[in-house]
């Protein structure tokens, strides 16, 4: 008996060929002895099964002597034996329709689990493989889990289901729900206006949610909600705002926050949620900002850092073109009595600049300029 | 020339069997299915079912299967039609017919008269 | 199962004018570019006979006058002119699945 696999909803053509090649006696019925189809000279008569309006044959090959079943939108009870009568012979097909069905919704928020269920026909007993985007595999039996998904996990899932040695491959398409970057630090020098955007890794046609970003500045002893937006159909609505920082926020995605200035007391960590419709859970990114700010006072030259910064960061003051005079790990830095001149206050990882600060310095009986 | 010779009238009393012929000439028996058609006196006509002569098998109306047994000789080119357990509901003239090459029903025997009458 | 209903139930003629019988299907019975009806006449006594298939195909043996025509449910029977031995019951039936499904007739009488 042939063993024929077919994926639920999809189409499956069962072959039937008679030695004769010409239009023939021929009809397919299932195994409880149920027409399906048939054919009378030219045209086809179709069975009182419950096939009967997906049910379908090829007339244009019925003179080669090729009599296929044609059964569309595959049902899982669709998997059965059918036999094709064709002059004095039969022909066995064993048909057996799986589906492959992610749990919920194959839009899943970064951190939630995937589970992929099989359904398969009762006496089977099928094995399956599924490879995700970024090239892992996993394998089980009815059901698949996936835990912790990840943004490399969105794209094409490739599974394949085993039977008989015979195989039918499913491909899933996942979203997962996530900003393109966990987290993000901006630098600015004290005074400079700052953009903070936080771009989604994942299109969708209606985007509907509420977001919020809370903020904690490195001064203050508790974080604050700085904004709460709405989001409706990829259009942006504040909802609120504090007075201080006044932030202001762009109508379209991506989600886009301006700070009119850059100021110590502000320097710190956000934390930026999306609640999305429907979805359980929320989207998180955090965003971080280190805010410079060089100053003369008499003698003293000084450049300071706010904000989240790692240990490893040096921070420097240097004359323009010359070695730097001092260099620390350290969130300020100073010299005292500084020679007149472009100085240079610079916050740098491994040698690459992060941020920069100049400061004019006058000779003595002067005042300071700062650019 | 087709011909469908269909066997005799038949007076059976209730309760009884009754099986009727029909032998086909004219064309190779095993190319064409033979439908089996009932008309009560003055009424309409109801498909009671059909037998694929290549294979032997048969297909019924769902209101017919159990009261009628549709079989084929091939060999005598003969098909059989079977009536069990009959009561006066199954008086009518029974046809044998087979298609052309068209849709439609366009060879039919001369009709067998079941009377069942106690 | 597929329903047909046939009307008039009964038709008076003239000699040499139209006689138009219509029939109705519960569903379409087309498939794949062809309308899966038939139109038989039967007189008392004998056997139907096939006048039209798959909806318009005139069977061999028969007079132009019969013609057929529709698609999907709705199909009709044209007779033109008739003629005295037309006169008969004329039915409708579908063979587009099983069990095929006859309606119940129409009497023709030709005055």
């Known amino acids: 008996k042939k063993v024929v696999l077919g994926k639920k909803g999809d189409t499956v053509e069962l072959t039937c060929t008679a030695s004769q090649k010409k239009s023939i006696q021929f009809h397919w019925k299932n195994s409880n002895q149920i027409k399906i189809l048939g054919n009378q000279g030219s045209f086809l008569t179709k069975g009182p099964s419950k096939l009967n309006d997906r049910a379908d044959s090829r007339r244009s090959l019925w003179d080669q002597g090729n009599f296929p079943l044609i059964i569309k939108n595959l049902k899982i009870e669709d998997s059965d034996t059918y036999i094709c009568e064709v002059e004095d012979q039969k022909e066995e097909v064993q048909l057996l329709v799986f589906g492959l069905t992610a749990n919920s919704d194959t839009h899943l928020l970064q951190g939630q689990s995937l589970t992929l269920t099989l359904e398969s026909p009762p006496g089977s007993s099928p094995s399956v493989q599924c490879r995700s985007p970024r090239g892992k595999n996993i394998q089980g039996g009815k059901t698949l889990s996936v835990s912790q998904l990840e943004l490399q996990d969105s794209g094409t899932w490739t599974c394949t289901v085993l039977q008989n040695q015979k195989k039918v491959e499913f491909k899933i398409d996942i979203v997962v729900l996530a900003f393109q970057k966990a987290s993000s630090i901006v630098y600015k020098k004290e005074g400079e206006q700052v953009e903070f955007s936080f771009p989604l890794a994942f299109t969708v046609e209606k985007l509907t949610g509420s977001g919020e970003l809370w903020w904690q500045a490195e001064r203050a002893s508790s974080s604050k909600s700085w904004i709460t937006f709405d989001l409706k159909n990829k259009e942006v609505s504040v909802k609120r705002v504090t007075q201080d920082p006044k932030l202001q926020m762009g109508k379209k995605l991506p989600l886009h926050l301006t700070l009119p200035q850059a100021l110590p007391q502000y320097a710190g960590s956000g934390n930026l949620t999306l609640a999305l419709e429907a979805k359980t859970g929320k989207l998180h990114q955090e965003v971080n900002l280190v805010v410079m700010r060089a100053t003369q006072l008499q003698k003293n030259l000084t450049c300071e850092v706010w904000g989240p910064t790692s240990p490893k960061l040096m921070l420097s003051l240097k004359l323009e073109n010359k070695e730097a005079k001092v260099s620390k790990r350290e969130k300020a830095v100073w010299v005292l009595n500084p020679e007149a001149g472009m100085w240079q206050c610079l916050l740098s990882d491994s040698g690459q600049v992060l941020l920069e600060s100049n400061i004019k310095v006058l000779p003595t009986w002067s005042t300071p300029v700062q650019p | 020339m087709v011909h469908l010779q269909e066997s005799e009238p038949e007076l059976v009393k209730p309760g009884a069997s009754v099986k009727m012929s029909c032998k086909a000439s004219g064309y190779t028996f095993t190319d064409y299915v033979i439908n089996w058609v009932k008309q009560r006196t003055g009424q309409g006509l109801e498909w009671i079912g059909e037998t694929y002569t290549g294979s032997g098998s048969s297909y019924y109306n769902e209101k017919f299967k159990d009261k009628a047994t549709l079989t084929v000789d091939k060999a005598s080119n003969i098909a059989y039609m079977q009536l069990s357990s009959l009561t006066s509901e199954d008086s009518a003239v029974y046809f044998c017919?087979?298609?052309?090459?068209?849709?439609?029903?366009?060879?039919w025997g001369q009709g067998t008269l079941v009377t069942v009458s106690a | 199962d597929i329903v047909l209903t046939q009307s008039p139930a009964s038709l008076a003629v003239s000699l040499g004018q139209r006689a138009t019988i219509s029939c109705k299907a519960s569903q379409s019975v087309d498939y794949d570019g062809d309308s899966y009806m038939n139109w038989y006449q039967q007189k008392p006594g004998q056997p139907p006979k096939l006048l039209i298939y798959a909806a318009s195909n005139l069977e061999s043996g028969i007079p132009a006058r019969f013609t057929g025509s529709g698609s999907g449910t709705d199909f009709t029977l044209n007779i033109h002119p008739v003629e005295e031995e037309d006169t008969a019951t004329y039915y409708c039936q579908q063979s587009y699945e099983d069990p095929p499904t006859f309606a119940g007739g129409t009497n023709l009488e030709i005055k």
């Open positions: 017919a087979r298609r052309g090459k068209g849709t439609g029903f366009a060879f």
